[in-house]
Interface confidence: medium
């Protein structure tokens, strides 16, 4: 039977190699049943994830999944780093795995890592039963 837990389908150690100056959309695939949860993005600073308050975000709804998108218009060199999306659902916090952006300055584009180098690990999508309160370690 279908689970009605909120699920955040972010790749475990997923990575994106992107160019500064380009537009980019970072997607957080969100699966929910009835009420869409409140979702936010944050950027990791050491062990702390700093909420991104004043950034353009949007929802894209598809048949079986929704995407909460963080827009980079354009990508800036200091956008380099790891990001995480979080969902508030029935007073519980559900956190995704982090996804890392490797931003290459256009001037040094020839030094960009290849796609193969970026694909460091397989997928693991992160699920939490909504009745389990979760503190990410």
């Amino acid at each position: 039977k279908e689970s009605c837990d909120v699920q955040l389908y972010i790749k475990r150690q997923s990575e994106h190699s992107i160019l500064a100056g380009d537009p980019f959309e970072l997607e957080c695939p969100v699966k929910y049943c009835a009420n869409r949860p409140h979702v936010t993005w944050c950027k990791l600073n050491g062990t702390t994830c700093v909420k991104l308050e004043d950034r353009q975000t949007s929802w894209k709804e598809e048949k079986n999944i929704s995407f909460f998108i963080l827009h980079f218009e354009p990508v800036l060199p200091n956008d380099n780093g790891s990001y995480r999306c979080s969902a508030n659902f029935q007073s519980n916090l559900i956190e995704s795995h982090s996804t890392t952006l490797y931003v290459t300055d256009v001037k040094s584009a020839s030094e960009r890592p290849s796609k193969d180098e970026m694909a460091s690990r397989p997928w693991l999508l992160y699920r939490h039963h909504h009745h389990h309160h979760h503190h990410h370690h």
Epitope: Q7, Y9, K11, R12, Q13, P29, K31, N64, I65, H97, S98, S120, R121, P122, W123, L124, L125, Y126, R127, H137
Partner: antibody, heavy 121, light 112 residues
Framework: QITLKESGPTLVKPTQTLTLTCTFS??????????VSWIRQPPGKALEWLAH???????RFNPSLKSRLTITKDTSKNQVVLTMTNMDPVDTATYYC?????????????WGQGTLVTVSS | DVVMTQSPLSLPVTLGQPASISCKST???????????LNWLQQRPGQSPRRLIY???KLDSGVPDRFSGSGSGTDFTLKISRVEAEDVGVYYC?????????FGQGTKVEIK
């Protein structure tokens, strides 16, 4: 009921390309989080993971064989196809496909019966 | 790559007696999500592998409770409390925490 079944040639010549098909039922690769792996086992030896494909066509390969491997899926046919180029006698093995879902609780929970591929001239 | 080392490689056992297989990894298998992706598989003679245990200690449905898994970090153990004839075969550990996924070299369990 979940089943997987491998099919392909039993004998290939050195330097040829091997194409294997995994036909499965009881789950769909169009379902979010679903995936299928290929694993091989040379006669009398241990298992070796080769490649994995996910519902969204994301692919992962064993780096030691990546340059020789291709993995594709046909969601409508419930099939995953593995191709391995430049076959060598050391590639003689039983090739298995197995299911691997996103939550870690279904990594390799269902396996096919395997198909023995012999590489010989 | 993470190397999975099993011991012993051959394990002659007496029916009804316990058996234990060790699996050691060259890196910790504790993932950032708090889970440890360590499975045990059984391969009976002439058959395809069958998963017995996942996430270190969770038994697959249909697996007799004489099988148990334990361990953490880099050291893991599969135990059979009382070996039965149908337990003969090769047992593999597998890790899915680090890419590429890797298997142990196998432990052959046979009856004395």
């Amino acid at each position: 009921q979940i089943t997987l079944k491998e099919s392909g040639p039993t004998l290939v010549k050195p330097t040829q390309t091997l194409t294997l098909t995994c036909t499965f039922s009881g789950f769909s690769l169009s379902t979010f989080g679903m995936g299928v792996s290929w694993i091989r086992q040379p006669p009398g030896k241990a298992l070796e993971w080769l490649a994995h494909i996910y519902w969204d066509d994301d692919k992962r390969f064993n780096p030691s064989l990546k340059s020789r491997l291709t993995i594709t899926k046909d969601t409508s046919k419930n099939q995953v196809v593995l191709t391995m180029t430049n076959m060598d006698p050391v590639d003689t093995a039983t090739y298995y496909c197995a299911r691997g879902n996103w939550d870690g609780e279904t990594y390799f929970d269902y396996w096919g019966q395997g198909t023995l591929v012999t590489v010989s001239s | 790559d993470v190397v999975m080392t099993q011991s012993p490689l051959s394990l002659p056992v007496t029916l009804g007696q316990p058996a234990s297989i060790s699996c050691k990894s060259t890196q910790s298998l504790l993932d950032s999500d708090g889970k440890t992706y360590l499975n045990w598989l059984q391969q009976r003679p002439g058959q395809s592998p069958r998963r017995l245990i996942y996430l270190v200690s969770k038994l697959d449905s249909g697996v007799p409770d004489r099988f148990s898994g334990s361990g953490s970090g880099t050291d893991f153990t599969l135990k059979i409390s009382r070996v039965e004839a149908e337990d003969v075969g090769v047992y593999y550990c597998w890790q899915g925490t680090h890419f590429p996924w890797t298997f142990g070299q196998g432990t052959k369990v046979e009856i004395k």
